[in-house]
Amino acid sequence: LTCLGGFASPGPVPPSTALRELIEELVNITQNQKAPLCNGSMVWSINLTAGMYCAALESLINVSGCSAIEKTQRMLSGFCPHKVSAGQFSSLHVRDTKIEVAQFVKDLLLHLKKLFREGQFN
């Protein structure tokens, strides 16, 4: 997680702060949403379990031309230990349901807030 320092503050960021930043960004996306997020683009739903950060990134990275989630994509890359590129689905164990990006963000936010409240920062 030390690489997360690049986008928000100089030097390494504690895991709790890194998760805070991601939650803040997702809250901002959900609260500032006017038109359909990313023009209603659909992404693969993910299991919010182990490998969730990489899975979330693999799903969202296939949405292009959507500036609203670019910061989220960068943040998720800081939580994922391997490089993720479009079309890569190594962490997406199940690919059977597609949902709108807006719903994906809401589901991810709820889960991350629970992890934060539980003190699970890694």
Epitope: S9, R20, E24, Q31, K113, F116, G119
Partner: antibody, heavy 123, light 107 residues
């Protein structure tokens, strides 16, 4: 109107277990985003956070006291209970419960407090 | 744990004076800083959350500012009813920690 009311024994003997109850009015701990904290204040001193519990039963404790603390909730009675084991005279304090809300950013700000209950630990 | 240091520990000012209380965190708390007012014999009351957001019903003479590790509570014009002890509290992450308090008295 949101109010919280603490109740406790007043006097506890050293080594005993202290049980405190916080009754909630004007809001429910079964409602999403609601949480309750316990804080204590020794006479003439500052505030010390003890523990909190969320609507979904997520619990967190002050690491310095974690081995002695247990927080629980009874949603049907709209109450939160805090137990502190093996009490000592240094645990003498006014014990407060307070509400916190986690909607949007999780601010961990306690927006409504009970009036507090004074607990004296003495033989 | 995040340590919170308040200064001064006490101050005396005249009615109408501008009063400032400082709070320093041992690490960057990203504006997750809350202020409480505690009058003698009473429970604390939330004044300000997230550095500068006024809690409902709090007079506008109270304001908060700061970022990173340094935060300030300002009373723009001290009133007799403001006699109290003021505490800062970090809300970045548990364990939640409070400053030692600042006792405000009227000259």
């Amino acid at each position: 109107e949101v109010t919280l009311r603490e109740s406790g024994p007043g006097l506890v003997k050293p080594t005993q277990t202290l049980t405190l109850t916080c009754t909630l009015y004007g809001f429910s701990l079964s409602t999403s985003d609601m949480g309750v904290d316990w804080i204590r204040q020794p006479p003439g001193k500052g505030l010390e956070w003890l523990a909190h519990i969320w609507w979904d039963d997520v619990k967190r404790y002050n690491p310095a006291l974690k081995s002695r603390l247990t927080i629980s909730k009874d949603t049907s009675k709209n109450q939160v209970v805090l137990k502190l084991t093996s009490v000592d005279p240094v645990d003498t304090a006014t014990y407060y419960c307070a509400r916190t809300v986690s909607s949007g950013y999780i601010y961990y700000a306690m927006d409504y407090w009970g009036q507090g209950t004074l607990v004296t630990v003495s033989s | 744990d995040i340590q919170m240091t308040q200064s001064p520990s006490s101050l005396s000012a005249s009615v109408g004076d501008r009063v400032t209380i400082s709070c320093r965190a041992s690490q960057d708390i990203r504006n997750y800083l809350n202020w409480y007012q505690q009058k003698p014999g009473k429970a604390p009351k939330l004044l300000i959350f997230y550095t500068s957001k006024l809690h409902s019903g709090v007079p506008s003479r109270f304001s908060g500012s700061g970022s990173g590790t340094d935060y300030t509570l300002t009373i723009s014009s001290l009133q007799p009813e403001d006699i109290a002890t003021y505490y800062c509290q970090q809300g970045l992450t548990p364990p939640l920690t409070f400053g030692g308090g600042t006792k405000v008295e009227i000259k």
